[in-house]
């Protein structure tokens, strides 16, 4: 409430710009916090199903956009099938999460492998089968799986027949999908998340065309694909809430990425305002509807009424709160390359203990799993990765501080990646596994890095002790 | 299957209230909307306004001073409420089940605001 | 309020005739748009949603076309039991408003 009255941003993010040490919500007094994390606090691990499981046309699976994506646009990648083949060798990943000793493993479904046309018919038993024995692996360990229905490999099919997430028919077609996972796996899945970082897909996906399918330049298009990615999560939350949750009782939330920015001018209104939007603008964009009242945030809805589609008072009230937890991204894909509008002339940061105070402050304090974390190497690294290291020691050290210092209600941090794979536009070029691997080899080893031992400890003593 | 259902009291003197009771059943009110609307005879529809599965309500601006809306999700009835009938309140009143349409409409309840 | 000019006010056509009935709104409602159908006896149900939904249970001679500020009804091979009034809807803005109605009476 105080905060509310004083710095006239009623209750919005643009507090965290405050410098002002009595209003701005983020206590900078302690720059390293030697404590643990809560009791129980979940500690995982990620990777999506187009990064590392290979085999992108074996055993009956159906090519995605990203297989042709990499086939006609991205130079010297002739495919996935190079990557760290996560479906032939299954259990050299059990035996990495079982190394690591991990509370969850976040991983994707590859909807083509298991309806190579997209249409939910017939499932692809293959397909069906690697999920299913992963997952009773996964129990089996007393791992709890995060399961991701949507890390951007759509299939083929659906792009070429109805023009992908431009089409509103997708969305249907997206919650049939989600239907047959609910009913072939949410046995044994208690938390699920239907779409991974929607901006990317709507941003680079139609506006950059960095990602698949790799269309550039239609703004209209850009926002008329988050919107459906939108009202396809809105659609399958009140399909599992009313059909699946009485007796599954799991939970279901959408992974939202952004950055963090900085003012130029950090006593200046305009630059404080300009960060706000900047802000709004990736983030807002989704959480807003989903997080917030229904509506997109009122300064796109201005600036883009032109392209923006509307959400009808019916929809509004149908997309607000159709998450059960705040599922954040915060990592490279949101950095770099950074839309040049977003920045706004800025200085962007990886503060992500701000990151999380703007959502604490602009959602109304939810509880928050950390959905994606952690940075890059250059590909040469190998088992050496120090700057792997030092990075993951300042996000869990903000992520620290956020809980302990600002109250902030995180209860989850999934480390990413388990593996070196495939890394969108930058192709082999970087790494983000914890685990090396060498692409060219056949058996694939999982060799821990220094950042596996160093997160095995920090999961081991559940924080920073001195 | 899904019904619902207007109940009314025919007749209202001027600068009486109207109640009315909307009567569902084959859906929740936790989550669906319901909307009324009303018909003056021998002319067109107008909404009136709509109580959201969240309890939240929008009103026609027209209407907005006199209208109440509200609702008993454990009983499945939602009410309506207008203060201060004049005569060019005479209508037949129509709840309907909502989204971004009205999918299910009651066989409405004809309201005569007479002395 | 967003205004709905509905036209014709009334027509008449014969059995299996195909006739159209239009909507003009005096702004853009972006397809959120639907027709009704109410019978002589008053009793009301929704024909076409989001501009060209078919509800469950319409037969398929409804069908519903625009965009913008245009938007159509038609209906194909006209029977006996189509002896109804028709009205356009929207929901783009509140207040939710109404077409006029279209009496559509057979020869």
């Known amino acids: 409430i105080l905060l509310r009255a004083v710095t006239g941003f009623s209750g919005d993010g643009r507090a965290i710009w405050s410098k002002n040490p009595n209003f701005t919500p983020v206590n900078e007094s302690q720059l390293f916090l030697y404590d643990t994390f809560p009791k129980n606090f979940f500690w995982g691990i990620g990777t999506g199903a187009l990064q590392v499981e290979g085999s992108w046309k074996k055993d009956g699976k159906g090519p995605s956009i990203w297989d042709h994506f990499i086939h006609t646009h991205l130079k010297n990648v002739s495919s996935t099938n190079g990557s760290s083949d996560s479906y032939i060798f299954l259990e050299k990943d059990l035996s990495a999460l079982d190394f690591i000793g991990v509370s969850f493993y976040q991983f994707s479904i590859s909807w083509p492998r298991l309806f190579p046309d997209g249409i939910v018919t017939v499932a692809n038993a293959k397909g069906l089968q690697y999920y299913s024995t992963l997952l009773d692996a996964l129990v089996l360990r007393n791992i709890e799986p995060i399961v991701t229905l949507y890390h951007w490999d759509l299939p083929l099919a659906l792009q070429e027949k109805y023009g992908g997430w431009k089409n509103d028919t997708i969305i249907d077609i997206f919650n049939d999908y989600a239907t047959y996972c609910f009913q072939m796996f949410g046995d044994r899945v208690k938390y699920w998340i239907t779409i991974h970082n929607p901006y990317l897909v709507a941003w680079h996906g139609y506006g950059t065309g960095m990602h698949a399918p790799g269309e550039k330049g239609n703004l209209a298009a850009v926002y008329t694909v988050g919107h459906n990615l939108i009202k396809a999560h809105s659609k399958v939350w009140h399909n599992y809430n009313t059909h699946f949750r009485p007796h599954q009782k799991g939970w279901l939330s959408i992974t939202l990425g952004s950055h963090w920015i900085e003012p130029n001018r950090s006593e200046n209104t305009m630059d404080i305002f300009k960060c706000q939007q900047s802000m709004v603008s990736v983030l807002g964009w989704f959480a807003n509807p989903i997080h917030g009242d229904g509506d997109y945030p009122e300064g796109m809805r201005k600036k883009l009424f032109s392209v923006l589609p509307i959400f009808s008072e019916a929809e509004k009230h149908e997309m607000r709160g159709t998450a059960d937890f705040f599922a954040f991204s915060f990592g490279p894909n949101n950095f770099k390359p950074l839309n040049t509008m977003a920045k706004m002339g800025q200085n962007v940061s990886l503060n992500l203990r701000e990151a999380l105070n703007w959502i604490k402050l602009e959602y109304n304090n939810p509880r928050i799993l950390i959905a994606e974390n952690g940075w890059f190497t250059d590909s040469r690294v190998k088992t050496e990765d120090t700057t792997a290291i030092y990075m993951m020691k300042n996000f869990l050290s903000q992520v620290l501080q956020a809980i302990r210092l600002d109250e902030i209600r995180v209860f989850g941090y999934t480390a990413w990646s388990l593996l070196d794979g495939f890394e969108w536009q930058d192709a082999y070029t970087i790494r983000r596994g914890l685990f090396y691997v060498d692409f060219n080899s056949k058996q694939k080893e999982r060799k821990p890095k220094s950042s596996a031992h160093y997160y095995k400890q920090i999961i081991r003593e559940n924080g920073f002790s001195l | 299957q899904v019904q619902v259902k207007e109940s009314g009291p025919g007749l209202v003197a001027p600068s009486q209230s109207l109640s009315i009771t909307c009567t569902v059943s084959?859906?929740?009110?936790?989550?669906?909307?319901v909307s009324w609307i009303r018909q003056p005879p021998g002319k067109g529809l107008e909404w009136l306004g709509v109580?959201?599965?969240?309890?939240?309500?929008n009103y026609h601006s027209a209407l907005i001073s006199r209208l109440t809306i509200t609702k008993d999700n454990s009983k499945s009835q939602v009410f309506l409420k207008l203060n201060s009938l004049e005569a060019d309140d005479t209508a037949t009143y129509y709840c309907?089940?909502?989204?971004?349409?009205?999918?299910?409409w009651g066989q409405g309840t004809l309201v005569t605001v007479s002395a | 309020d967003i205004q709905m000019t509905q036209t014709p006010s009334s027509l008449s056509a014969s059995l299996g005739d195909r006739v159209t009935i239009n909507c003009r709104a005096s702004?853009?409602?972006?397809?959120?748009f639907n027709w009704y159908q109410q019978k002589p006896n008053g009793t009301i149900k929704l024909l076409i949603y989001?501009?060209?939904r078919l509800q469950s249970g319409v037969p398929s001679r409804f069908s519903g076309s625009g965009s913008g500020t245009d938007y159509s009804l038609t209906i194909s091979n006209l029977e006996q039991e189509d002896k109804a009034t028709y009205f356009c809807?929207?929901?783009?803005?509140?207040?939710?408003?109404f077409g006029g109605g279209t009496k559509l009476e057979i020869k």
């Open positions: 309907a089940k909502t989204h971004d349409w009205f999918d299910y």
């Open positions: 084959g859906f929740s009110l936790t989550n669906y909307g």
């Open positions: 109580i959201w599965g969240d309890g939240s309500i």
């Open positions: 702004q853009d409602i972006s397809n959120y």
């Open positions: 989001y501009t060209s």
């Open positions: 809807h929207q929901v783009r803005t509140l207040p939710w408003t």
